[in-house]
């Protein structure tokens, strides 16, 4: 795992910065790990960030990653009315410039370099789940969910008219 | 147009069971956590129960006036939700509101009209 | 569970002049870097309408008068010219925790 040094340097910078054209209405740095307490982690590998989950040794420090918080509205059909409400969408950066991206093409979640402002990949709906946990949904991909695959971050189709276990879509989020 | 459309509600004798429907229209209900919200005559508000999503394996959670007592339910393919109310008592005398948590559940956003409880003999 | 105290009960302010409530938490109402508070307004014979989320932030439609602030345990709803059509109970209300609580609610009434 990389360090994040650069993410507290540049953390109060961003309070002014503009990002989609709007302020994030505030900022939270914390660890990422999946419902199970596997951390999630970023490592520096052949020139590109690679993104893993894995069960940290003892006393190993987590990585950290910056949310960025926005208000947004819904962005399904039936938010037309403006009667589904605003919801908040987060970015996630674990370190300067790179942020987690939705490729839904490969159905995979990557760390990109970007300028700004984010692509709408970057954002992601942040939802408020029970148990301490969070879930975060595509921007660009309504039902299609950060999740846990095979070790690795990827995009899961959630169906709520199905049964499926969501135990991999949920998130810790901690400041320690 | 987004709808609730609360029923069932009307006089009951204390120890006695009633049961609240909550008809959802105009927009996806097997999407949205459900709540039920109550006010008592002159008094403030009163969070009740709250039922979650199929993938949620459809959770449940009540306040603790409640709890062993009241039951939360709802039935995706008629758009409704429901509040059983068993071994009703003069305090649950109240509004009941059926209402909608906004999509990423961070707050109540629609709200019924709601229907009236009386429990007394 | 959480306990959230409302200041004052009732208040009755000038039409447009500021109007101020305050909301206790007995515990901090933060987590994952935001305030689980939310405010609400009730007027007579209608349902709550969901005014201000995590603190500070406006419901969709929501007049630019009411605004909120606040994190931790010290919350404020502020109307910045009380209209006519504001007379109603106002009341905050935490998600952090099951159970949900409400304040006991604050009505705004003109002087």
């Known amino acids: 795992a990389f360090g994040i040094s650069g993410v507290q340097k540049y953390t109060r910078a961003l309070h002014d910065s503009s990002i989609t054209g709007i302020s994030p209405i505030t900022e939270y740095l914390a660890s990422l790990s999946t419902y199970n307490d596997q951390s999630i982690t970023f490592a520096l590998e052949d020139e590109s960030y690679e993104i893993y989950v894995e069960d940290l040794k003892k006393d190993e420090k987590k990585d950290k990653v910056l949310l960025s918080y926005y208000e947004s509205q819904h962005p399904s059909n039936e938010s037309g009315d403006g009667v589904d409400g605003k919801m908040l969408m987060v970015t996630l950066s674990p370190t300067k410039d790179f942020w987690l991206h939705a490729n839904n093409k490969e159905h995979s979640v990557e760390l990109h370099k970007c300028e700004k402002p984010l692509p709408d990949q970057a954002f992601f709906v942040l939802h408020n789940m029970h148990s301490n946990c969070v879930s975060f949904e595509c921007k660009t991909d309504p039902g299609v969910f950060i999740g846990v695959k095979d070790n690795h971050l990827a995009l899961i189709k959630v169906d709520s008219s199905e049964n499926l276990c969501t135990e991999n879509i949920l998130f810790k989020l901690s400041e320690t | 147009e987004v709808q609730l459309v609360e029923s069932g509600g009307g006089l009951v004798q204390p120890g006695g069971s009633l049961r609240l429907s909550c008809a959802a229209s105009?927009?996806?209900?097997?999407?949205?956590?459900m709540n039920w919200v109550r006010q008592a005559p002159g008094k403030g508000l009163e969070w009740m129960a709250e039922?979650?999503?199929?993938?949620?394996?459809?959770?449940?959670h009540y306040a603790e006036s409640v709890k062993g007592r009241f039951t939360i339910s709802r039935d995706n393919s008629k758009n409704t939700v429901y509040l059983q109310m068993n071994s009703l008592r003069a305090e649950d005398t109240a509004v009941y509101y059926c209402?909608?948590?906004?999509?990423?559940?961070?707050?109540?956003?629609?709200w019924g009209q709601g229907t009236l409880v009386t429990v007394s003999s | 569970d959480i306990v959230m105290t409302q200041s004052p009960d009732s208040l009755a302010v000038s039409l447009g002049e500021r109007a101020t409530i305050n909301c206790r938490a007995s515990?901090?109402?933060?987590?994952?870097?935001?305030?689980?508070l939310n405010w609400y307004q009730q007027k007579p014979g209608q349902p709550p309408k969901l005014l201000i989320f995590?603190?500070?932030s406006q419901g969709s439609g929501v007049p630019d008068r009411f605004s909120g602030s606040g994190s931790g345990t010290d919350f404020t709803l502020t109307i910045s010219s009380l209209q006519a059509e504001d007379v109603a109970v106002y009341y905050c209300?935490?998600?952090?925790?099951?159970?949900?609580?409400f304040g006991q609610g604050t009505k705004v009434e003109i002087k």
């Open positions: 039922i979650t999503l199929k993938f949620n394996d459809y959770s449940t």
């Open positions: 209300q935490q998600s952090k925790d099951i159970p949900y609580t």
């Open positions: 209402a909608r948590r906004n999509y990423g559940n961070w707050y109540i956003n629609v």
């Open positions: 995590v603190a500070s």
């Open positions: 105009g927009f996806t209900f097997s999407n949205y956590w």
């Open positions: 515990e901090s109402v933060d987590k994952f870097g935001v305030s689980f």
